[in-house]
Interface confidence: medium
């Protein structure tokens, strides 16, 4: 029951996480204009991975997509790639985990198969979450670097004179959505991996069984039948696989007259 709950919760958490990663990737507000000490407050700029927008105090908003690939910074391309890989892996993971859910029966799928699928989806969720966190963190680092460079430029400017305008960009809402979503996907993946351990059937060890005499008075009859002694009620010479049966590991054999030829 606990395993089913862990698996189900892991699936739901990952589902929310991946939905968040998709939302973050599509959002326009990855970076927003820092309006502190900005002389032109009538205009607000914000950028996403796919387009940039301008919003004015009058309500006028205009967005334009990045129609060029060559002119874009390599870091932006890398972030796009990381987010897309995260989404693809997450989507595949979700698909796999649906079939792996213990509460869903598909044909005569064995628990071992479900366990393997759960582990696979768990690993996919973990990698997906890490991709999203990495992508958002790379972008955030890019912003922080540019922000402080811009701040330096504001006070030095061209040829040592004060530069009157310098646009600085800071963290947009998408970054926070991405971080949280990546974290949730990661947690969901870990939960799936934990659930996998509970789903995996116990290994059946078919150990070699040796039949040893319980006492010195016990004789073996041909045909593998245990001789009737005062210890058991096997009067009809039925084949016995329990009682005196012990594995090689469990019993220490004592020498008897039958052990040597």
């Amino acid at each position: 029951m606990a395993v089913t709950a862990c698996q189900g919760l892991g699936f739901v958490v990952s589902l929310i996480g991946i939905a968040g990663i998709i939302a973050a990737t599509c959002m326009d507000q990855w970076s927003t204009q820092d309006l502190y000490n900005n002389p032109v407050t009538a205009v607000f700029n914000y950028q996403g991975l796919w387009r940039s927008c301008v919003r004015e105090s009058s309500g006028f908003t205009e967005c334009r997509g990045y129609f060029t690939l060559l002119g874009l910074p390599a870091m932006l391309q890398a972030v796009r790639a990381l987010m897309i890989v995260g989404i693809v892996l997450g989507a595949i993971g979700l698909l796999v985990s649906i079939f792996a859910l213990k509460c869903i029966r598909i044909g005569s799928m064995e628990d071992s198969a479900k366990a393997n699928m759960t582990l696979t989806s768990g690993i996919m969720f973990i990698v997906s979450g890490l991709c999203a966190i990495a992508g958002v963190s790379v972008f955030a680092n890019m912003l922080v670097t540019n922000f402080w460079m811009s701040t330096a430029n504001m006070y030095t400017g061209m040829g040592g004179m004060v530069q009157t305008v310098q646009t600085r960009y800071t963290f947009g809402a998408a970054l926070f959505v991405g971080w949280v979503a990546g974290g949730l996907t990661l947690i969901g993946g870990v939960m799936m991996c934990i659930a996998c351990r509970g789903l995996a059937p116990e290994e059946t060890n078919y150990k070699a069984v040796s039949y040893h005499a319980s006492g010195h008075s016990v004789a073996y009859k041909p045909g593998g039948f245990k001789a009737s002694t005062g210890f058991g009620s096997n009067t009809k010479n039925k084949k016995i696989y329990d009682g005196g049966a012990r594995t090689e590991d469990e019993v220490q054999s004592y020498p008897s007259k039958h052990d040597y030829v």
Epitope: A42, V43, N45, R51, S52, V54, E56, V165
Partner: nanobody
Framework: DVQLVESGGGLVQAGGSLTLSCAAS????????MGWYRQAPGKQRELVAD???????NYADAVKARATISRDNAKNTMYLQMNNVKPEDTAVYYC????????????WGRGTQVTVSS
Amino acid sequence: DVQLVESGGGLVQAGGSLTLSCAASRSDLFISIMGWYRQAPGKQRELVADISRGGKTNYADAVKARATISRDNAKNTMYLQMNNVKPEDTAVYYCYAQISNPFWGDYWGRGTQVTVSS
């Protein structure tokens, strides 16, 4: 690389008018704000006027009644018309553009000299 090219500067008689134009070297740029700044000898650079994509304008008090700023978003060009120019308008006029796409940044032109003779 992006270049902003100013034109229209020169020697102007006091009381006369002048029109400055600024053009971006690429027409595919998404410029949110374009503006004119000026720097008189020994003084700091100051805003003359700026204009947003939506046409919202902002003027310095010194030129408010005498200047008109306009832009063509499709061509990424901007114009500044100044009437009744005064000797104190003598300065190097710089074009400024705040680019949002395909990369972000603030760009300046090399400047054009405007001299008002009395």
